[in-house]
């Protein structure tokens, strides 16, 4: 008879990702002999809760669980029923929740016990509900790319752990009310809160981190719009032909949009808005986003903001990919240099709204806003964050690495579960032939 | 061509049970969810709950929870909606709805694209 | 939950009229989905996500808005679309329906 080897066990996480505009869990697994080696924790499966995210819950905060169960009970099925009660379960809320706390704390804190309700229903290990701040979304995101991509440490073929040479990727969030960005930087920060000091397998990181608020594609949609209605009597970013009716209201109900709001203005009253595809007067709308007027510190990125010289490569993910991508794949433009990426949006903001619906058929109630989003974006790069083109190179526009969703969820539950240790394994894995 | 063809009229008494079906074809059954919506006599539309085929995930709306079960089975490519014991409000007309959906930035959006034809339940004594 | 309102209840108007509908949500919804039953049909899907068009549905119907204020426009009217009209919502659970605007021949 000879042994039959069984497969080795695996572990299991899941991680809710409550966003702004949706909520996303996340099943992970890995081996559970190989706890500590980088890139092993893979994505098992995932779900989309049906429905917005958590924050817009406020008025109906048990809906906000009620909305989790198709999705929890899915996980019942994919996690195997003897590993439920060692399976870690979390949910971090972002900036839709930051948002809502901001304005609304005890409908915060209702919506968090919601959902809190319906996670401790399941069998899993319940670590809590917390929104997650602006830097913790950052960095775990951070570490999500560079675990995923192995840049933290390698497995040598003698044996031995070592750090490959190729350096750390910074990386780009475009939320829906938030976007972040996270780099690893040799300048020491003038700005205690965007320095994190990371200690992973033995290795020091130094990692410049700026979450900004309001910087969502969402929320930077109605704050254009808000300065839309506020300085033309026509969307300069929407595509001539393209018309919709405007509650004031449902504008100026945002924290985001509160600069633009008036003094006076009828909640209850409705304006008809119509585009006018004009790429000048649509950048210079977006412009107004960011202030370069003053810098308490020796450089600075937007909003007196202190952000070191950008270094290195860099993955951009979520609504950064999903923007380019649109800009590469439905209107076929080239996006690989940063003067491409603004002809390209140029060239979005110049179509009619008929020429748009012609090239992309089927996706009318979105294609309005591609024009002022492909703007934002190409200005948050260059203007914002100060990529030039040589810098720009080195910008990958990515969803996924290594079969995974890049975003902070995976970096979150790493940190959570000890799956990164801060100093090497021990124990060499192999022999050593030295 | 996408269909979904329902069950008959049911005449049914108080305290009765009752299962409708709700057959589909024309697309893969376990890609999309099947919805149910309830409609009673002169009135608006609600939504009763879902099955997930592929999962075999039922979710349902928290007025009708206990009240029914929706259940599929994948082999006939067909969802059901059952009472264990009726009662004379539950008289309406019952539709099963395919969930479509399209994805934009990464996310699913759903909305109602194909509907049955729709069951008339009336309960009396 | 989300409360859908929707104006007129019912309204009478000629074929050739332009006719609209409007949907008042309660709480600020993503999108809206209008939909079309006639006496003894299922609803028919006529617009999805705010302001697309479901496949086969005349370009006389089109949708817009936002937040909590949504339209559906039939730009002239036509003595097949003499119905009842829902709108819908799928951005918060539990998914909910307008009470529905009858639209009758003058």
């Known amino acids: 008879t000879r042994d039959i080897r069984e497969p080795p066990a695996l572990k299991y996480g899941i991680v809710l990702d409550a966003g702004s505009s949706h909520t996303s869990m996340f099943i992970y697994k890995w081996p559970a002999d190989k706890e500590n080696d980088t890139g092993i924790v893979g994505q098992h499966s995932s779900c989309d809760v049906p429905g917005g995210g958590i924050s817009s819950y406020a008025d109906n905060p048990s809906g906000a669980g009620q909305s989790l169960v198709g999705c929890l009970e899915q996980a019942l099925r994919d996690v195997p029923k003897e590993r439920h009660a060692g399976t870690p379960l979390y949910l971090g809320a972002t900036a839709g929740m930051r948002l809502l706390n901001l304005t609304n704390p005890e409908a915060s804190t209702s919506v968090l016990t919601a959902v809190t309700h319906t996670l401790t229903q399941y069998p899993f290990d319940f670590r809590g509900a917390r929104i997650l701040s602006g830097q913790e979304e950052g960095v775990f995101g951070w570490v999500t790319a560079n675990y995923l991509l192995e840049n933290f440490i390698k497995y040598g073929w003698v044996g031995r752990w070592f750090r490959p040479r190729k350096g750390t990727l910074g990386a780009m969030d475009l939320g829906g009310a938030s976007t972040q960005i996270t780099f690893e930087t040799t300048s020491p920060a003038e700005d205690r809160a965007s320095e994190v000091q990371l200690r992973l397998y033995g290795q020091h990181y130094r990692v410049y981190t700026h979450s900004f608020l309001c910087y969502g594609r969402d929320q930077v949609l109605q704050r254009l719009l808000a300065s839309a209605l506020q300085t033309h009597s026509f969307h300069p970013c929407w595509p001539r032909g393209f018309s919709t009716h405007v509650l004031l209201g449902d504008v100026y109900q945002s924290p985001c949009t509160v600069a633009q709001r008036p003094q006076t203005f009828n909640s209850s009253a409705r304006v008809s808005l119509s585009g006018s595809s004009d790429p000048h007067l649509c950048r210079d709308l977006v412009s107004g986003l960011f202030s370069f007027s003053s810098c308490p510190f020796s450089r600075c990125s937007f909003n007196g903001v202190f952000q070191p010289p950008v270094a290195g490569n860099f993955i951009a993910f979520s609504a950064f990919f999903y923007t380019v991508n649109f800009l590469r794949t439905s209107m076929g433009l080239p996006v690989a240099t940063l003067q491409q990426l603004e002809a390209a949006a140029v060239n979005v903001c110049n179509q009619t709204w008929a020429q748009l619906q012609a090239r992309v058929p089927g996706q009318q109630a979105h294609l309005a806003d591609y024009c002022a989003g492909a703007m934002f974006v190409q200005q948050l790069l260059s203007r914002g964050y100060g990529f030039d083109e040589r810098a720009f190179g080195g910008v990958i526009f990515q969803k996924k690495a290594a079969d995974t969703a890049v975003g902070w969820a995976l970096g979150y539950m790493l940190n959570l579960t000890n799956l990164i240790p801060a100093d090497p394994p021990g124990l060499r894995k192999g022999t050593d032939f030295s | 061509e996408v269909q979904l063809v329902q069950s008959g009229a049911e005449v049914k008494k108080p305290g009765e049970s009752l299962k409708i079906s709700c057959k589909a074809s024309?697309?893969?059954?376990?890609?999309?969810?099947m919805d149910w919506v309830r409609q009673m006599p002169g009135k608006g539309l609600e939504w009763m709950g879902d099955?997930?085929?592929?999962?075999?995930?039922?979710t349902y709306n928290q007025q009708f929870k206990g009240q029914v079960t929706i259940s599929a089975d994948k082999s006939i490519r067909t969802a059901y909606l059952q009472w264990s014991s009726l009662k004379a409000s539950d008289t309406a007309m019952y539709y099963c709805?395919?969930?479509?959906?399209?994805?934009?930035?990464?996310?699913?959006?759903?909305?109602?694209?194909?509907w049955g034809q729709g069951t008339l339940v009336t309960v009396s004594s | 939950d989300i409360q859908l309102t929707q104006s007129p209840s019912s309204l009478s108007a000629s074929v050739g009229d332009r006719v609209t509908i409007t949907c008042s949500a309660s709480?600020?919804?993503?999108?809206i989905h209008w939909f079309q039953q006639k006496p003894g049909k299922a609803p028919k899907l006529l617009i999805y996500s705010t302001s697309n068009l479901a496949s086969g549905v005349p370009s006389r119907f089109s949708g817009s808005g936002s937040g909590t204020f949504f339209t559906l426009t039939i730009s002239s009217l036509q003595p097949e679309d003499f119905a009842t009209y829902f709108c819908h919502q799928w951005s918060s659970y539990p998914w909910t329906f307008g009470q529905g605007t009858k639209v009758e021949i003058k």
């Open positions: 709805a395919r969930r479509g959906f399209f994805l934009y930035y990464g996310i699913n959006y759903y909305y109602f694209d194909v």
């Open positions: 709480s600020s919804v993503s999108y």
């Open positions: 024309g697309y893969t059954f376990t890609d999309y969810n």
């Open positions: 099955i997930n085929p592929k999962y075999d995930i039922s």
